[in-house]
Interface confidence: low
């Protein structure tokens, strides 16, 4: 079965620059299929733009200005690239690649889409590092004791643009765990978002990872934020006691990553 | 030119209660086209659900049913037992691939229908409230409440900033919420929640430690380790790529 990956979740450009959006095809030979590109402008319908067929023929949608979009494919890397020249405000959109995939039964085909790349146009001069800056929160003792479960929270701040994907995994597993997240929020010229994962008591002694995909991650790779295992077998309850007021009973440890 | 028009812009559905989405074709007979349905979820992922001739995407056949009403020139998609996973924007799209004669292999899309999922009506449930802290950051975690209306207050005299709470459906079909803020006096911040004409405080749920061994941090990278009131780490952790440390005893 064909699968499409768009490695860039967003691409930020200044006006009149050129944007190159990539689509990696797997599970099917790129030179044996047609790749289609669609765009979804804010508030508009998803619209076909251009396709490149198995024999290299390029077909553009009528009404699309010539010279605006260029599509090609590189069989060696199984990649199709959509090039958008002279980007302008009306190019702000999410761009999807797609292909027809044959189902088990003859003649039955479905069109599958890549995850999309959002083209962002900015003229802000932003700080050099606008990758997501993580802060981790470990489960409160009260939650682990009372509910036999614990919630990890992963806060990501000071990133730009606003497009970000967060998922959670156990350390040595590729299974994506069911998590919850808040909306992406604007703070001055950058954004913040948080995601949380509640795990049963039996999983608290495992290491968990909050995995973050963002355009400006260092070296373009997903950022992995490690949540250490928790020991839960040593706590006693005293519901009347507000421990945060007991200075003798708190040791605050803050380690902050400030490396480049 | 043909146009696909969804019946509604937004459709609120309740968990477990069947829902129907409709999409009518303007300017052409729907029988001349194949109809497709897609779902776009958070993060823009476009997932194929259904194509005419009984083709379903992986995992959709049991909970979705596609149909065409030739007489009314519309396409129908039924969600048989909605769950919180079914929240998203649903798009109808058409093509003529494989119909013979003049065909188009491009999809023509309609506008999306936003499906919002709400928990089923159920007995009211009081939330549990927990506070999590790291440096100046404080998170108030509010778990398993119903109905949705809630006010979350992080109580502090030295607020730096606060963010709107995130309220989501919990896996059990109630609501969870998190409110985040930054405070100069994060140590003393508590959380109080107004729900169903009652106030619930995080202090109602607090516990006392007898031991020093709750958090067992491992070597981490690219993280800020938590400042936890009530937790006594056994030792200062030597962490790679960390070059700033503050200790408050």
């Amino acid at each position: 079965a064909g699968h499409l990956e768009q490695p860039q979740i967003s691409s930020t450009k200044t006006l009149s620059k050129t944007a190159r959006l990539e689509c990696v095809v797997s599970g099917i030979t790129i030179s044996a299929t047609s790749v289609y590109w669609y765009r979804e402008r804010p508030g508009e319908v998803i619209q076909f733009l251009v396709s490149i067929s198995y024999d290299g023929t390029v077909r553009k949608e009528s009404g699309i200005p010539s010279g605006k979009f260029e599509v090609d494919r590189i069989p060696e890397t199984s990649t199709s690239t959509l090039t958008i020249h002279n980007v302008e405000k009306q190019d702000i959109a999410t761009y999807y690649c797609a292909l027809w995939e044959a189902q088990q039964e003859l003649g039955k085909k479905i069109k599958v889409f890549g995850p999309g790349t959002k083209l962002i146009i900015t003229d802000k001069q932003l700080d050099a590092d606008v990758s997501p800056k993580p802060t981790i929160f470990l489960p409160s003792i009260a939650e682990t004791k009372l509910q036999k479960a614990g919630t990890y929270l992963c806060l990501l701040e000071k990133f730009f643009p606003d497009v970000i994907k967060i998922h959670w995994q156990e350390k040595k597993s590729n299974t994506i765990l069911g998590s919850q997240e808040g909306n992406t929020m604007k703070t001055n010229d950058t954004y913040m978002k948080f995601s949380w994962l509640t795990v049963p008591e039996k999983s608290l002694d495992k290491e968990h990872r909050c995995i973050v995909r963002h355009e400006n991650n260092k070296n373009g790779v997903d950022q992995e934020i490690i949540f250490p295992p928790i020991k839960t077998d040593v706590i006693t309850m005293d519901p009347k006691d507000n421990c945060s007021k007991d200075a003798n009973d708190t040791l605050l440890l803050q380690l902050t990553n400030t490396s480049a | 030119a043909i146009e696909l028009v969804p019946e509604h812009q937004t459709v609120p559905v309740s968990i477990g209660v069947p829902a129907t989405l409709r999409c009518s074709m303007k300017g052409e007979a729907i029988g001349n086209y194949y109809i497709n349905w897609y779902r776009k979820t958070q993060g823009n992922t476009m997932t194929f659900i259904y194509r005419e001739k009984d083709i379903y995407g992986p995992g959709f056949k049991d909970n979705f049913q596609g149909d065409i009403d030739i007489a009314k020139n519309l396409a129908v998609l039924k969600i048989l037992a909605p769950s919180e996973r079914d929240e998203g924007s649903y798009y109808c799209a058409c093509d003529t691939l494989g119909m013979g004669g003049e065909y188009t292999d491009k999809l023509i899309f309609g506008k999306g229908t936003r499906v919002t999922v709400e928990p089923r009506s159920q007995p009211h449930t009081k939330p549990s409230v927990f506070v999590m802290k790291n440096g100046t950051n404080v998170a108030c975690l509010v778990k398993e409440f119903y109905p949705k209306d809630i006010r979350i207050n992080l109580v502090s005299s030295k607020k730096i900033t606060e963010f709107d709470p995130a309220i989501v459906i919990s896996p059990s079909g109630k609501y969870n919420a998190v409110k985040l803020g930054k405070y100069e006096d994060s140590n003393s911040v508590t959380c109080s929640v107004q729900h169903d004409n009652k106030t619930v405080h995080s202090t109602d749920f607090e516990v006392k430690t007898d031991s020093t061994d709750h958090v067992k941090p491992k070597e981490t990278e690219n993280t800020k380790q938590p400042s936890k009131s009530c937790h006594k780490p056994k030792a200062i952790v030597h962490t790679e790529k960390v070059n700033m440390m503050s200790l408050t005893v």
Partner: antibody, heavy 124, light 112 residues
């Protein structure tokens, strides 16, 4: 499509206040800056101030500081402009304006979409 | 405040002929981020203003290509290369480099 719908015309006495509303539809309200601009009869355009609802902190032109209050209600996607101590020279059409949905949300200065205008007449 | 001065005050033109409006700012409109936040708006009789050009020369979507903007620093020009009847109205330049946002006094384009 983004639309801004303003409240109806007002006739006010000198010294009183007027509050004009501007309801946004068709897009995220929070992140886009709403500007208030006025135009006296036969005159040009004058920027009074603006607000990004997410932040809730307005920016005012010095000329109107102390007399104008700009607010936003996120729950109803509505921005408000209240002008107090009205005098006859405040007779004008008051417009709200904001970027369209194609604009990144920090284009404070963009005024792609305009309300229909609210006529405020100050007369004794 | 930055003062925006437009000339001429009024511009009577023949249909199909070009028109040119000038706008001068009291100080440079080059922002510290390198951009020049100079826009042109059109206001037809009885209507709210409408954005035509942003950042000196970028045409807003849906604006006919007979409208063009040029200039730099403190001197800017809006050109209509063949005036049509629907172009009648008042044209304003506006700066957003500095608070408060300020507008030119307007130039009335009318048909001879």
């Amino acid at each position: 499509e983004v639309q801004l719908v303003q409240s109806g015309a007002e006739v006010k006495k000198p010294g009183s206040s007027v509050k004009v509303s501007c309801k946004a539809s068709g897009d995220t309200f929070n992140n886009y800056a709403i500007s208030w601009v006025r135009q006296a009869p036969g005159q040009g355009l004058e920027w009074m101030g603006g607000i990004i609802p997410f932040f809730g902190t307005p920016d005012y032109a010095q000329k109107f500081q102390g007399r104008v209050t700009i607010t936003a209600d996120k729950s109803t996607s509505t921005a408000y402009m209240e002008l107090s101590g009205l005098r006859s020279e405040d007779t004008a059409v008051y417009y709200c304006a904001r970027p369209g949905s194609g604009s990144p949300d920090y284009y404070y200065y963009d005024m792609d979409v305009w309300g229909q205008g609210t006529t405020v007449t100050v007369s004794s | 405040d930055i003062v925006m001065t437009q000339t001429p005050l009024s511009s009577p033109v023949t249909l199909g002929q070009p028109a040119s409006i000038s706008c001068r700012s009291s100080q440079s409109l080059v922002h510290s981020d390198g951009n020049t936040y100079l826009s042109w708006l059109q206001q037809r009789p009885g209507q709210p203003p409408r954005l035509l050009i942003y950042k000196i020369s970028n045409r807003f979507s849906g604006v006919p290509d007979r409208f063009s903007g040029s200039g730099a620093g403190t001197d800017f020009t809006l050109k209509i290369n063949r005036v049509e009847a629907e172009d009648v109205g008042v044209y304003y330049c506006m700066q957003a480099t500095q608070f408060p946002l300020t507008f030119g006094g307007g130039t009335k384009v009318e048909i001879k």
